[in-house]
């Protein structure tokens, strides 16, 4: 029941991040212009990652998309990037999570199958939220560089009595946005991986092998502590021997060519 | 077709308060920012205040900050100057206008003359 | 405050002749944003409210004549009447739409010889 929960919460908790990485990413308000030296601007500059805007006071805004793509900073280039991956991942991520959710039952899915989905899915989802955290963090860095040489280039070029007051951008909400979605993102897919270790099956597949000693039976075990995936924690007591060679898990074990010596 | 008729205007004392009503039709009024700007006779242009369109932004110019305030009634279609402490240099034909993309004047009413002498 | 100056004060021409006045703003009133220069013109006729002809400093108004051009950038803006009527008669004036205070220039007035 808690894996279930677990599984259900990430999903979510996934979900509402990847549809905020993907809210971020298609958002104008990356950068906004500084207010502190005119809180009552008659026109407002906000920049996104596809187009920058301008809210003027009259009411009207007017949006330019930007045409080129050799002519952008690289920066910014590197910046889509990290978001449209981020969105691919998460997106790839959602659709096996909805697969690998053990409420869901498709055919005669195994355990073992969704396990290897929740854990993948979850995965995607870390890698995305990092894309995004890592876009964002690049663009805010941008940000701050640039605000900085533009308070210092401020008054430069004063010709006679012509000022070129730079514009100066700040953060904007798409950066809050982007940073909260992809820590969303990046905790769903840890409880994604967390209830992958619960929904893998107890034991390894390896059938028990029976030495027979002179007086009893003695089965020897050699899966005893899970090795496959790393996420088994055995916290159950297992049993070494066993009388019937049978593993714990099975009701009925049949015998192959390597069961005997 | 776009309408504003500026009223209110007249002869005031110094010191004195004077209210000008703008009342505009034709258009959608609650969608616009609306400005005063007037001119001293045989002078130039002088924007005075701007209200953008929700009413909760004001701004003026520093020759009547704290004297005067601009208001509207999206209700009655009406642009407001509430003019207090007038002063001689205050004189001049208030204009009613409408701003529009580019925060361009397109529409501007026939003016109301607003004398401070005593 | 944003300077807005015109030059010449006055000038006389003669009918059909090619006019132009300047405007010269003491910041740039280019938006980083979209890119457009916020300068407006606007004609004044004798005993009438002034007329938009231009806003975003070269975008004419609808009904305004097409011998009228709005040009520059930044901080130089240009109004020119390439060929001048009789009912161009008026005061000119270009405004900063940029920031607040919007500020008028002083005018130019255009008379015919």
């Known amino acids: 029941m808690a894996v279930t929960a677990c599984q259900g919460l990430g999903f979510v908790v996934s979900l509402i991040g990847i549809a905020g990485i993907i809210a971020a990413t298609c958002m104008d308000q990356w950068s906004t212009q500084d207010l502190y030296n005119n809180p009552v601007t008659a026109v407002f500059n906000y920049q996104g990652l596809w187009r920058s805007c301008v809210r003027e006071s009259s009411g009207f805004t007017e949006c330019r998309g930007y045409f080129t793509l050799l002519g952008l900073p690289a920066m910014l280039q590197a910046v889509r990037a990290l978001m449209i991956v981020g969105i691919v991942l998460g997106a790839i991520g959602l659709l096996v999570s909805i697969f690998a959710l053990k409420c869901i039952r498709i055919g005669s899915m195994e355990d073992s199958a969704k396990a290897n989905m929740t854990l993948t899915s979850g995965i995607m989802f870390i890698v995305s939220g990092l894309c995004a955290i890592a876009g964002v963090s690049v663009f805010a860095n941008m940000l701050v560089t640039n605000f900085w040489m533009s308070t210092a280039n401020m008054y430069t070029g004063m010709g006679g009595m012509v000022q070129t007051v730079q514009t100066r951008y700040t953060f904007g909400a798409a950066l809050f946005v982007g940073w909260v979605a992809g820590g969303l993102t990046l905790i769903g897919g840890v409880m994604m991986c967390i209830a992958c270790r619960g929904l893998a099956p107890e034991e390894t597949n390896y059938k028990a092998v029976s030495y027979h000693a002179s007086g009893h039976s003695v089965a020897y075990k050699p899966g005893g502590f899970k090795a496959s995936t790393g996420f088994g924690s055995n916290t159950k007591n297992k049993k070494i021997y066993d009388g019937g060679a049978r593993t714990e898990d099975e009701v009925q074990s049949y015998p192959s060519k390597h069961d005997y010596v | 077709e776009v309408q504003l008729l500026e009223s209110g205007g007249g002869l005031v004392q110094p010191g004195g308060s004077l209210r000008l009503s703008c009342a505009a039709s034709?258009?959608?009024?609650?969608?616009?920012?609306m400005s005063w700007v007037r001119q001293a006779p045989g002078k130039g242009l002088e924007w005075v205040a701007t209200?953008?369109?929700?009413?909760?932004?004001?701004y003026y110019a520093d020759s009547v900050k704290g004297r005067f305030t601009i208001s509207r009634d999206n209700s009655k279609n009406t642009l407001y100057l509430q003019m207090n402490s007038l002063r001689a240099e205050d004189t001049a034909v208030y204009y009613c206008?409408?701003?529009?993309?580019?925060?361009?004047?397109?529409?501007w009413g026939q003016g109301t003359l607003v004398t401070v002498s005593s | 405050d944003i300077v807005m100056t015109q030059s010449p004060d006055s000038l006389a021409v003669s009918l059909g002749e090619r006019v132009t006045m300047n405007c010269k703003s003491s910041?740039?009133?280019?938006?980083?944003?979209?890119?457009?220069?916020?300068l407006s013109w606007y004609q004044q006729k004798p005993g009438q409210p002034p007329k938009l002809l231009f806003y975003?400093?070269?975008t004419r108004e609808s009904g305004v004549p097409d011998r009228f051009s709005g040009s520059g950038s930044g901080t130089d803006f240009t109004l020119t009447i390439s060929s001048v009527q009789a009912e161009d008669v008026a005061v000119y004036y270009c405004?900063?739409?940029?920031?607040?205070?919007?500020?008028f220039g002083q005018g130019t007035k255009l008379e015919i010889k």
């Open positions: 910041q740039s009133l280019l938006s980083s944003g979209n890119q457009k220069n916020y």
């Open positions: 975003w400093a070269s």
């Open positions: 209200i953008i369109i929700g009413g909760s932004y004001t």
């Open positions: 206008t409408r701003l529009v993309k580019g925060q361009a004047m397109d529409y």
């Open positions: 405004q900063n739409d940029y920031s607040y205070p919007f500020t």
């Open positions: 034709g258009f959608t009024f609650s969608s616009y920012t």
